[in-house]
Protein backbone atom coordinates (compact mmCIF):
# COMPACT_ATOMS: atom_id res chain seq x y z
CA UNK A 1 0.00 0.00 0.00
CA UNK A 2 1.29 3.47 -0.88
CA UNK A 3 1.58 6.30 1.62
CA UNK A 4 1.53 9.29 -0.73
CA UNK A 5 -1.66 11.20 0.01
CA UNK A 6 -3.90 12.56 -2.70
CA UNK A 7 -3.64 16.32 -3.16
CA UNK A 8 -6.17 18.76 -4.54
CA UNK A 9 -5.60 20.45 -7.87
CA UNK A 10 -4.65 24.13 -7.82
CA UNK A 11 -4.03 27.04 -10.22
CA UNK A 12 -7.08 26.11 -12.29
CA UNK A 13 -6.87 28.30 -15.38
CA UNK A 14 -9.03 28.70 -18.47
CA UNK A 15 -7.16 28.89 -21.78
CA UNK A 16 -9.52 29.84 -24.58
CA UNK A 17 -9.05 31.18 -28.09
CA UNK A 18 -11.90 31.54 -30.58
CA UNK A 19 -13.91 29.31 -28.20
CA UNK A 20 -11.41 26.42 -28.27
CA UNK A 21 -11.37 26.09 -24.50
CA UNK A 22 -9.04 24.10 -22.28
CA UNK A 23 -8.92 23.99 -18.51
CA UNK A 24 -5.40 23.66 -17.10
CA UNK A 25 -4.29 22.97 -13.55
CA UNK A 26 -1.45 21.78 -11.35
CA UNK A 27 0.22 19.67 -10.02
CA UNK A 28 1.54 16.95 -12.28
CA UNK A 29 0.02 13.87 -10.67
CA UNK A 30 1.97 11.52 -8.46
CA UNK A 31 -0.03 8.44 -7.50
CA UNK A 32 -3.28 10.16 -8.39
CA UNK A 33 -5.60 10.86 -11.30
CA UNK A 34 -8.10 13.56 -12.13
CA UNK A 35 -11.65 13.82 -13.41
CA UNK A 36 -13.07 17.18 -14.47
CA UNK A 37 -16.65 18.35 -14.15
CA UNK A 38 -18.21 21.37 -15.83
CA UNK A 39 -21.48 23.11 -15.14
CA UNK A 40 -23.44 26.24 -15.94
CA UNK A 41 -24.66 28.23 -12.95
CA UNK A 42 -28.07 26.61 -13.18
CA UNK A 43 -27.19 23.30 -14.77
CA UNK A 44 -25.76 19.83 -14.25
CA UNK A 45 -22.26 18.87 -13.30
CA UNK A 46 -21.06 16.91 -16.31
CA UNK A 47 -17.93 14.77 -16.02
CA UNK A 48 -15.20 14.99 -18.65
CA UNK A 49 -11.62 13.73 -18.96
CA UNK A 50 -12.17 10.68 -16.80
CA UNK A 51 -9.40 9.31 -14.57
CA UNK A 52 -6.72 11.22 -16.46
CA UNK A 53 -3.08 11.83 -15.62
CA UNK A 54 -3.10 14.93 -17.82
CA UNK A 55 -3.25 18.37 -16.24
CA UNK A 56 -5.52 19.80 -18.87
CA UNK A 57 -8.98 19.03 -20.18
CA UNK A 58 -10.55 20.19 -23.42
CA UNK A 59 -14.00 21.50 -22.51
CA UNK A 60 -14.79 23.01 -25.90
CA UNK A 61 -17.62 20.57 -26.63
CA UNK A 62 -19.42 21.71 -23.51
CA UNK A 63 -18.95 25.48 -23.68
CA UNK A 64 -19.91 25.78 -27.35
CA UNK A 65 -23.42 24.59 -26.46
CA UNK A 66 -24.07 28.13 -25.25
CA UNK A 67 -21.15 30.56 -25.38
CA UNK A 68 -23.06 33.26 -23.50
CA UNK A 69 -23.54 31.09 -20.41
CA UNK A 70 -21.19 31.33 -17.44
CA UNK A 71 -19.39 28.08 -16.69
CA UNK A 72 -17.69 26.69 -13.64
CA UNK A 73 -15.42 23.66 -13.63
CA UNK A 74 -14.03 21.55 -10.83
CA UNK A 75 -11.19 19.07 -10.81
CA UNK A 76 -11.48 15.94 -8.66
CA UNK A 77 -8.39 14.14 -7.41
CA UNK A 78 -8.57 10.39 -6.89
CA UNK A 79 -5.87 8.10 -5.55
CA UNK A 80 -4.25 5.85 -8.13
CA UNK A 81 -3.63 2.25 -7.19
CA UNK A 82 -3.55 1.38 -3.51
CA UNK A 83 -2.86 4.87 -2.23
CA UNK A 84 -4.60 6.52 0.71
CA UNK A 85 -6.95 9.41 0.07
CA UNK A 86 -6.96 12.58 2.19
CA UNK A 87 -10.63 13.29 1.53
CA UNK A 88 -12.47 13.58 4.86
CA UNK A 89 -15.26 11.10 5.56
CA UNK A 90 -14.97 9.61 2.11
CA UNK A 91 -15.59 12.96 0.42
CA UNK A 92 -13.58 13.35 -2.79
CA UNK A 93 -11.03 16.12 -3.03
CA UNK A 94 -11.80 18.78 -5.59
CA UNK A 95 -10.99 22.35 -6.47
CA UNK A 96 -13.20 24.87 -8.27
CA UNK A 97 -12.13 26.93 -11.25
CA UNK A 98 -12.83 30.62 -11.66
CA UNK A 99 -16.07 31.34 -13.52
CA UNK A 100 -15.73 31.58 -17.29
CA UNK A 101 -18.05 33.22 -19.80
CA UNK A 102 -16.81 32.29 -23.29
CA UNK A 103 -18.52 35.13 -25.14
CA UNK A 104 -16.93 37.71 -22.89
CA UNK A 105 -13.59 36.07 -22.21
CA UNK A 106 -12.38 33.83 -25.04
CA UNK A 107 -9.27 35.30 -26.60
CA UNK A 108 -9.60 36.51 -30.15
CA UNK A 109 -7.28 34.47 -32.34
CA UNK A 110 -4.69 36.07 -34.55
CA UNK A 111 -6.53 37.20 -37.67
CA UNK A 112 -5.41 36.63 -41.23
CA UNK A 113 -5.58 39.04 -44.14
CA UNK A 114 -7.39 37.10 -46.84
CA UNK A 115 -6.80 39.49 -49.74
CA UNK A 116 -6.32 43.05 -50.80
CA UNK A 117 -7.38 44.58 -54.07
CA UNK A 118 -6.29 47.93 -55.44
CA UNK A 119 -8.51 49.94 -57.74
CA UNK A 120 -6.87 53.25 -58.56
CA UNK A 121 -6.30 55.12 -55.31
CA UNK A 122 -8.45 52.77 -53.23
CA UNK A 123 -7.45 49.46 -51.62
CA UNK A 124 -9.98 46.95 -50.36
CA UNK A 125 -8.51 44.80 -47.59
CA UNK A 126 -10.47 41.67 -46.61
CA UNK A 127 -9.98 39.84 -43.31
CA UNK A 128 -10.60 36.08 -43.24
CA UNK A 129 -13.72 35.22 -41.25
CA UNK A 130 -12.27 32.47 -39.14
CA UNK A 131 -14.29 29.35 -38.38
CA UNK A 132 -14.97 28.59 -34.73
CA UNK A 133 -15.99 25.34 -33.04
CA UNK A 134 -19.41 26.77 -32.21
CA UNK A 135 -22.12 24.88 -34.09
CA UNK A 136 -25.61 25.72 -35.24
CA UNK A 137 -27.69 23.27 -37.25
CA UNK A 138 -24.67 20.99 -37.59
CA UNK A 139 -22.48 23.65 -39.23
CA UNK A 140 -19.57 25.48 -37.66
CA UNK A 141 -20.11 29.19 -37.18
CA UNK A 142 -17.57 31.84 -38.09
CA UNK A 143 -16.31 34.45 -35.66
CA UNK A 144 -18.61 36.99 -37.32
CA UNK A 145 -21.59 34.62 -37.02
CA UNK A 146 -21.01 34.38 -33.28
CA UNK A 147 -20.11 37.97 -32.43
CA UNK A 148 -22.08 39.86 -35.07
CA UNK A 149 -21.59 43.61 -34.79
CA UNK A 150 -19.74 43.24 -31.49
CA UNK A 151 -16.70 42.24 -33.54
CA UNK A 152 -14.58 44.80 -35.31
CA UNK A 153 -11.15 45.00 -36.87
CA UNK A 154 -8.40 47.58 -36.72
CA UNK A 155 -6.18 47.95 -39.78
CA UNK A 156 -2.69 49.33 -39.40
CA UNK A 157 -1.01 50.25 -42.67
CA UNK A 158 1.99 52.11 -43.97
CA UNK A 159 3.80 52.79 -47.20
CA UNK A 160 6.47 50.18 -47.89
CA UNK A 161 8.95 53.00 -48.15
CA UNK A 162 8.20 54.63 -44.78
CA UNK A 163 7.59 53.84 -41.13
CA UNK A 164 4.71 56.24 -40.58
CA UNK A 165 1.58 54.25 -39.70
CA UNK A 166 -2.11 54.94 -40.17
CA UNK A 167 -5.09 53.07 -38.78
CA UNK A 168 -8.61 52.36 -39.91
CA UNK A 169 -11.53 50.62 -38.21
CA UNK A 170 -14.40 48.52 -39.49
CA UNK A 171 -17.36 46.61 -38.06
CA UNK A 172 -17.28 44.26 -41.06
CA UNK A 173 -14.45 42.13 -42.42
CA UNK A 174 -13.50 44.68 -45.07
CA UNK A 175 -11.64 47.97 -45.19
CA UNK A 176 -11.66 50.46 -48.04
CA UNK A 177 -8.78 52.88 -47.67
CA UNK A 178 -7.27 55.68 -49.72
CA UNK A 179 -3.73 55.18 -50.97
CA UNK A 180 -1.27 57.11 -53.07
CA UNK A 181 -1.10 55.93 -56.64
CA UNK A 182 2.11 54.09 -57.47
CA UNK A 183 2.93 53.35 -53.83
CA UNK A 184 3.06 49.90 -52.26
CA UNK A 185 1.59 49.47 -48.79
CA UNK A 186 1.94 46.97 -45.96
CA UNK A 187 -1.03 45.92 -43.83
CA UNK A 188 -1.70 44.28 -40.50
CA UNK A 189 -5.04 43.74 -38.77
CA UNK A 190 -6.21 43.17 -35.22
CA UNK A 191 -9.59 41.80 -34.14
CA UNK A 192 -11.32 43.84 -31.46
CA UNK A 193 -14.48 43.68 -29.36
CA UNK A 194 -14.80 47.26 -28.09
CA UNK A 195 -17.54 46.45 -25.57
CA UNK A 196 -15.30 44.07 -23.62
CA UNK A 197 -13.44 44.93 -20.46
CA UNK A 198 -10.88 42.09 -20.82
CA UNK A 199 -9.31 40.37 -23.82
CA UNK A 200 -10.50 43.20 -26.04
CA UNK A 201 -7.95 42.77 -28.81
CA UNK A 202 -6.24 39.93 -30.62
CA UNK A 203 -2.58 39.84 -31.51
CA UNK A 204 -1.68 41.44 -34.82
CA UNK A 205 -2.00 39.45 -38.00
CA UNK A 206 1.11 38.70 -40.02
CA UNK A 207 2.06 41.73 -42.11
CA UNK A 208 1.06 41.51 -45.78
CA UNK A 209 2.54 43.86 -48.33
CA UNK A 210 1.38 44.90 -51.79
CA UNK A 211 3.56 43.53 -54.52
CA UNK A 212 3.37 40.08 -52.92
CA UNK A 213 1.03 37.18 -53.64
CA UNK A 214 -2.10 38.11 -51.66
CA UNK A 215 -3.08 41.14 -53.68
CA UNK A 216 -4.87 41.83 -56.90
CA UNK A 217 -4.13 45.08 -58.65
CA UNK A 218 -6.22 46.96 -61.15
CA UNK A 219 -5.47 50.44 -62.49
Amino acid sequence: SGTTNTVAAYNLTWKSTNFKTILEWEPKPVNQVYTVQISTKSGDWKSKCFYTTDTECDLTDEIVKDVKQTYLARVFSYPAGNVESTGSAGEPLYENSPEFTPYLETNLGQPTIQSFEQVGTKVNVTVEDERTLVRRNNTFLSLRDVFGNDLGYILTYRKSSSSGKKTAKTNTNEFLIDVDKGENYCFSVQAVIPSRTVNRKSTDSPVECMGQEKGEFRE
Partner: antibody, heavy 121, light 107 residues
Protein backbone atom coordinates in the same frame (compact mmCIF):
# COMPACT_ATOMS: atom_id res chain seq x y z
CA UNK B 1 -13.97 -9.07 -34.09
CA UNK B 2 -13.61 -7.20 -30.81
CA UNK B 3 -13.57 -9.56 -27.87
CA UNK B 4 -12.37 -10.12 -24.32
CA UNK B 5 -11.46 -13.65 -23.26
CA UNK B 6 -11.06 -14.39 -19.57
CA UNK B 7 -9.27 -17.18 -17.73
CA UNK B 8 -11.13 -20.17 -16.30
CA UNK B 9 -12.98 -20.75 -13.05
CA UNK B 10 -11.06 -20.82 -9.76
CA UNK B 11 -11.67 -22.35 -6.35
CA UNK B 12 -9.74 -20.73 -3.50
CA UNK B 13 -9.49 -21.05 0.25
CA UNK B 14 -10.22 -18.08 2.55
CA UNK B 15 -7.14 -15.88 2.96
CA UNK B 16 -5.69 -16.90 -0.41
CA UNK B 17 -5.33 -14.73 -3.53
CA UNK B 18 -6.72 -15.13 -7.03
CA UNK B 19 -5.48 -13.65 -10.29
CA UNK B 20 -7.88 -13.46 -13.22
CA UNK B 21 -6.73 -12.59 -16.75
CA UNK B 22 -8.55 -10.89 -19.59
CA UNK B 23 -7.10 -10.96 -23.10
CA UNK B 24 -8.27 -8.28 -25.52
CA UNK B 25 -8.31 -8.61 -29.30
CA UNK B 26 -9.78 -6.88 -32.33
CA UNK B 27 -9.04 -3.28 -31.27
CA UNK B 28 -6.19 -1.04 -30.18
CA UNK B 29 -5.60 -2.18 -26.61
CA UNK B 30 -4.09 1.09 -25.38
CA UNK B 31 -7.00 3.24 -26.54
CA UNK B 32 -9.68 2.05 -24.12
CA UNK B 33 -9.92 1.80 -20.38
CA UNK B 34 -10.59 -1.61 -18.88
CA UNK B 35 -12.86 -2.10 -15.88
CA UNK B 36 -13.49 -4.99 -13.55
CA UNK B 37 -17.04 -5.67 -12.37
CA UNK B 38 -18.14 -8.51 -10.14
CA UNK B 39 -21.46 -10.22 -9.50
CA UNK B 40 -22.14 -12.39 -6.47
CA UNK B 41 -24.56 -15.30 -7.05
CA UNK B 42 -28.10 -13.96 -7.50
CA UNK B 43 -26.92 -10.39 -6.85
CA UNK B 44 -26.36 -7.21 -8.84
CA UNK B 45 -23.28 -5.75 -10.49
CA UNK B 46 -20.49 -4.10 -8.51
CA UNK B 47 -17.71 -1.96 -10.02
CA UNK B 48 -14.26 -2.76 -8.65
CA UNK B 49 -11.94 -0.44 -10.52
CA UNK B 50 -10.35 0.67 -13.74
CA UNK B 51 -7.00 0.40 -15.46
CA UNK B 52 -5.71 2.58 -18.26
CA UNK B 53 -3.78 0.13 -20.46
CA UNK B 54 -1.81 2.98 -21.99
CA UNK B 55 0.07 3.93 -18.83
CA UNK B 56 -1.02 1.21 -16.44
CA UNK B 57 -2.64 3.72 -14.08
CA UNK B 58 -5.32 2.20 -11.87
CA UNK B 59 -8.18 3.55 -9.76
CA UNK B 60 -10.04 1.27 -7.38
CA UNK B 61 -13.36 1.48 -5.59
CA UNK B 62 -12.63 2.27 -1.95
CA UNK B 63 -14.20 -1.00 -0.85
CA UNK B 64 -11.39 -2.94 -2.58
CA UNK B 65 -8.54 -0.55 -1.83
CA UNK B 66 -5.54 -2.45 -0.47
CA UNK B 67 -6.90 -5.84 -1.57
CA UNK B 68 -7.09 -5.50 -5.34
CA UNK B 69 -4.32 -4.99 -7.87
CA UNK B 70 -4.95 -4.47 -11.58
CA UNK B 71 -2.09 -4.78 -14.02
CA UNK B 72 -1.63 -5.08 -17.75
CA UNK B 73 0.79 -6.61 -20.24
CA UNK B 74 0.77 -4.53 -23.42
CA UNK B 75 2.79 -7.15 -25.32
CA UNK B 76 -0.08 -9.63 -25.04
CA UNK B 77 -2.97 -7.11 -24.72
CA UNK B 78 -3.92 -8.70 -21.43
CA UNK B 79 -5.16 -7.17 -18.20
CA UNK B 80 -5.06 -8.91 -14.83
CA UNK B 81 -7.05 -8.50 -11.64
CA UNK B 82 -5.62 -9.94 -8.45
CA UNK B 83 -7.73 -10.03 -5.30
CA UNK B 84 -6.06 -10.98 -2.02
CA UNK B 85 -7.19 -11.98 1.46
CA UNK B 86 -10.17 -13.76 -0.03
CA UNK B 87 -13.27 -14.36 2.05
CA UNK B 88 -16.50 -16.18 1.33
CA UNK B 89 -18.25 -12.93 0.33
CA UNK B 90 -15.80 -12.66 -2.59
CA UNK B 91 -17.45 -15.67 -4.25
CA UNK B 92 -18.68 -14.13 -7.49
CA UNK B 93 -18.38 -14.01 -11.25
CA UNK B 94 -15.67 -11.48 -12.15
CA UNK B 95 -16.00 -9.66 -15.47
CA UNK B 96 -13.58 -7.47 -17.35
CA UNK B 97 -15.31 -4.85 -19.46
CA UNK B 98 -13.99 -2.38 -21.98
CA UNK B 99 -15.28 1.05 -21.12
CA UNK B 100 -14.58 4.47 -22.49
CA UNK B 101 -11.40 6.49 -22.55
CA UNK B 102 -10.14 9.77 -21.16
CA UNK B 103 -12.58 11.64 -23.40
CA UNK B 104 -15.33 9.07 -23.98
CA UNK B 105 -18.27 8.03 -21.84
CA UNK B 106 -17.61 5.26 -19.36
CA UNK B 107 -20.03 2.79 -20.93
CA UNK B 108 -19.04 -0.87 -20.90
CA UNK B 109 -19.52 -1.81 -24.53
CA UNK B 110 -17.58 -5.10 -24.59
CA UNK B 111 -17.57 -7.66 -21.78
CA UNK B 112 -15.55 -10.77 -21.09
CA UNK B 113 -17.44 -14.03 -20.58
CA UNK B 114 -16.83 -13.90 -16.83
CA UNK B 115 -14.69 -15.93 -14.45
CA UNK B 116 -16.34 -17.74 -11.54
CA UNK B 117 -14.28 -17.48 -8.36
CA UNK B 118 -15.43 -19.64 -5.47
CA UNK B 119 -14.02 -19.05 -2.01
CA UNK B 120 -14.62 -22.03 0.24
CA UNK B 121 -12.81 -23.79 3.03
CA UNK C 1 -21.23 7.09 -3.30
CA UNK C 2 -24.08 7.79 -5.69
CA UNK C 3 -27.03 5.49 -4.99
CA UNK C 4 -28.98 4.27 -8.00
CA UNK C 5 -32.45 3.19 -6.95
CA UNK C 6 -34.00 0.99 -9.61
CA UNK C 7 -37.66 0.02 -9.69
CA UNK C 8 -39.44 -2.26 -9.86
CA UNK C 9 -37.10 -5.05 -8.78
CA UNK C 10 -39.12 -7.45 -10.94
CA UNK C 11 -42.06 -7.33 -13.30
CA UNK C 12 -44.15 -9.67 -15.39
CA UNK C 13 -45.64 -8.56 -18.70
CA UNK C 14 -47.16 -10.05 -21.82
CA UNK C 15 -45.51 -10.21 -25.23
CA UNK C 16 -46.26 -6.93 -27.02
CA UNK C 17 -46.67 -4.94 -23.79
CA UNK C 18 -44.90 -1.67 -23.17
CA UNK C 19 -42.46 -2.11 -20.29
CA UNK C 20 -41.01 0.78 -18.26
CA UNK C 21 -38.17 0.63 -15.72
CA UNK C 22 -37.00 3.63 -13.71
CA UNK C 23 -33.72 4.50 -12.09
CA UNK C 24 -33.34 7.37 -9.65
CA UNK C 25 -29.94 8.85 -8.81
CA UNK C 26 -29.28 10.10 -5.27
CA UNK C 27 -27.87 13.29 -6.78
CA UNK C 28 -27.55 15.00 -10.13
CA UNK C 29 -25.55 12.86 -12.57
CA UNK C 30 -26.26 14.86 -15.74
CA UNK C 31 -26.98 12.40 -18.57
CA UNK C 32 -24.11 10.10 -17.54
CA UNK C 33 -26.20 6.94 -17.33
CA UNK C 34 -26.14 3.64 -19.21
CA UNK C 35 -28.55 0.70 -19.40
CA UNK C 36 -27.56 -2.98 -19.70
CA UNK C 37 -29.36 -6.23 -20.37
CA UNK C 38 -28.17 -9.44 -18.73
CA UNK C 39 -29.57 -12.81 -19.68
CA UNK C 40 -29.13 -15.78 -17.29
CA UNK C 41 -25.58 -17.13 -17.28
CA UNK C 42 -24.36 -14.43 -19.68
CA UNK C 43 -22.36 -11.23 -19.40
CA UNK C 44 -24.28 -7.94 -19.46
CA UNK C 45 -24.82 -6.19 -22.79
CA UNK C 46 -24.86 -2.42 -23.32
CA UNK C 47 -28.18 -1.18 -24.72
CA UNK C 48 -28.34 2.57 -24.03
CA UNK C 49 -25.55 5.03 -23.25
CA UNK C 50 -25.69 8.65 -22.10
CA UNK C 51 -29.30 8.21 -20.96
CA UNK C 52 -30.90 8.09 -24.40
CA UNK C 53 -28.47 6.94 -27.10
CA UNK C 54 -29.08 3.51 -28.59
CA UNK C 55 -25.96 1.35 -28.87
CA UNK C 56 -25.20 0.17 -32.40
CA UNK C 57 -27.09 -3.00 -33.33
CA UNK C 58 -29.64 -2.71 -30.52
CA UNK C 59 -33.29 -2.94 -31.64
CA UNK C 60 -35.20 0.34 -31.73
CA UNK C 61 -37.89 -0.98 -29.35
CA UNK C 62 -35.44 -0.11 -26.56
CA UNK C 63 -35.21 3.53 -25.53
CA UNK C 64 -34.11 5.71 -22.64
CA UNK C 65 -34.92 9.17 -21.34
CA UNK C 66 -34.08 11.50 -18.49
CA UNK C 67 -35.93 13.98 -16.32
CA UNK C 68 -33.62 15.52 -13.73
CA UNK C 69 -32.33 12.69 -11.56
CA UNK C 70 -34.97 10.26 -12.83
CA UNK C 71 -34.14 7.98 -15.74
CA UNK C 72 -36.55 5.79 -17.64
CA UNK C 73 -35.84 2.71 -19.73
CA UNK C 74 -38.62 1.53 -22.04
CA UNK C 75 -39.26 -1.55 -24.14
CA UNK C 76 -42.03 -0.41 -26.50
CA UNK C 77 -43.20 -3.92 -27.38
CA UNK C 78 -41.90 -6.75 -25.21
CA UNK C 79 -40.50 -9.74 -27.11
CA UNK C 80 -39.77 -13.24 -25.76
CA UNK C 81 -36.04 -12.67 -26.23
CA UNK C 82 -36.20 -9.65 -23.91
CA UNK C 83 -36.50 -11.88 -20.84
CA UNK C 84 -33.53 -10.71 -18.78
CA UNK C 85 -32.42 -8.53 -15.90
CA UNK C 86 -31.83 -4.87 -16.72
CA UNK C 87 -29.36 -2.61 -14.91
CA UNK C 88 -28.69 1.12 -14.94
CA UNK C 89 -25.18 2.46 -14.28
CA UNK C 90 -23.93 5.98 -13.60
CA UNK C 91 -20.45 7.23 -14.45
CA UNK C 92 -20.63 10.90 -13.51
CA UNK C 93 -19.08 10.33 -10.09
CA UNK C 94 -16.44 8.01 -8.70
CA UNK C 95 -16.99 5.21 -7.92
CA UNK C 96 -19.15 4.05 -10.81
CA UNK C 97 -22.33 2.50 -9.44
CA UNK C 98 -25.13 0.26 -10.70
CA UNK C 99 -28.81 0.05 -9.90
CA UNK C 100 -30.04 -3.11 -8.18
CA UNK C 101 -31.52 -4.55 -11.36
CA UNK C 102 -34.99 -5.27 -12.70
CA UNK C 103 -35.92 -8.82 -13.63
CA UNK C 104 -38.34 -8.92 -16.57
CA UNK C 105 -40.45 -12.04 -17.08
CA UNK C 106 -43.19 -13.04 -19.52
CA UNK C 107 -46.71 -13.58 -18.16
Amino acid sequence: QVQLVQSGAEVKKPGASVKVSCKASGYTFANYYMHWVRQAPGQGLEWMGIINPSGGITVYAQKFQGRVTMTRDTSTSTVYMELSSLRSEDTAVYYCARGGSKVAALAFDIWGQGTMVTVSS
Amino acid sequence: DIQMTQSPSSLSASVGDRVTITCQASQDISNSLNWYQQKPGKAPKLLIYDASNLETGVPSRFSGSRSGTDFTFTISSLQPEDIATYYCQQYNFHPLTFGGGTKVEIK
